[in-house]
């Protein structure tokens, strides 16, 4: 069937970057500026999308492909190809309703988006808190207490060397 | 009923000038997007200019960028090419165009009138 309709209709015959133009006899025409089509026997090409405002064009619309957009300094990314841009907060913070918030005590963000984590619970692995945790930085965890008793490290300490012509006491 | 008729074409030397009118009826030329499109002997339809978006922001082909300038009368409701320093390979039948932007999203382009015959020889 597909082949068959292939060989009936002009339209297929168009490229991308063109249009099956109805009014002048199927011919393909050229996409108007600022529109693309990306796969060859549309009837119609579609608007390029505009990196506008917050946006910023990483690529140019051309007649074959459309236009992608990031954001301008101070924002990143969300959604599918960037459909949206979000404030950037500082390190130890979030993004609120109301703006860039600190992370709360026991909480952190290392990243200039997303929200505030809760520290490592390093009590759940039977582990010590190493380095304490801060707005930007998670905690980090040591060895467990038991690990940490009097003679029961499992790293054997390296004998002392002997010198020559010396028994041991 | 949308009209587009061209007018202004002839046959002018290498280095010449000349300047294409479109006179619009059945639609507001200042509100819509409008440009030319050109066929050359033996070759498709190819985009030479046009003004997108009511902000009136301009747009060229490379191969005729710093030659040609479009502009337009919003009381004539009248769209001009004013070209300048023509080559050989600016022969083609010039279009006058509208942008057709339908409902579902897609868009296509209008060219009601017969064009007028630009000839570049010397």
């Known amino acids: 069937f597909e082949r068959t309709r292939s060989l009936q209709d002009p339209c297929s015959n168009c490229p991308a970057g063109t249009f099956c133009d109805n009014n002048r006899n199927q011919i393909c025409s050229p996409c108007p500026p600022n529109s693309f089509s990306s796969a060859g026997g549309q009837r119609t090409c579609d608007i390029c999308r505009q990196c506008k405002g917050v946006f910023r064009t990483r690529k140019e619309c051309s007649s074959t492909s459309n236009a992608e957009c990031d954001c301008t300094p101070g924002f990143h990314c969300l959604g599918a190809g960037c459909s949206m841009c979000e404030q950037d907060c500082k390190q130890g913070q979030e993004l609120t309703k109301k703006g860039c918030k600190d992370c709360c005590f026991g909480t952190f963000n290392d990243q200039k988006r997303g929200i505030c984590r809760p520290w490592t619970n390093c009590s759940l692995d039977g582990k010590s808190v190493l380095v304490n945790g801060t707005k930007e930085r998670d905690v980090v965890c040591g060895p467990s207490p038991a690990d940490l008793s009097p003679g029961a490290s499992s790293v054997t300490p390296p004998a002392p060397a002997r010198e020559p012509g010396h028994s041991p006491q | 009923e949308v009209q587009l008729l061209e007018s202004g074409g002839g046959l002018v030397q290498p280095g010449g000038s000349l300047r294409l009118s479109c006179a619009a009826s059945?639609?507001?030329?200042?509100?819509?997007?409008v440009g030319w499109v050109r066929q050359a002997p033996g070759k498709g339809l190819e985009w030479v200019s046009a003004?997108?978006?009511?902000?009136?922001?301009?747009y060229y082909a490379e191969s005729v960028k710093g030659r040609f300038t479009i502009s337009r009368d919003n009381a004539k409701n009248t769209l001009y090419l004013q070209m300048s320093s023509l080559r050989a390979e600016d022969t083609a039948v010039y279009y006058c165009?509208?942008?057709?932007?339908?409902?579902?999203?897609?868009?296509?382009?209008?060219?009601r009138g017969q064009g007028t015959q630009v000839t570049v020889s010397s």
């Open positions: 165009a509208r942008v057709v932007y339908h409902a579902g999203g897609g868009v296509t382009f209008d060219t």
């Open positions: 059945g639609f507001t030329i200042s509100a819509e997007d």
């Open positions: 003004i997108l978006d009511f902000g009136g922001s301009t």
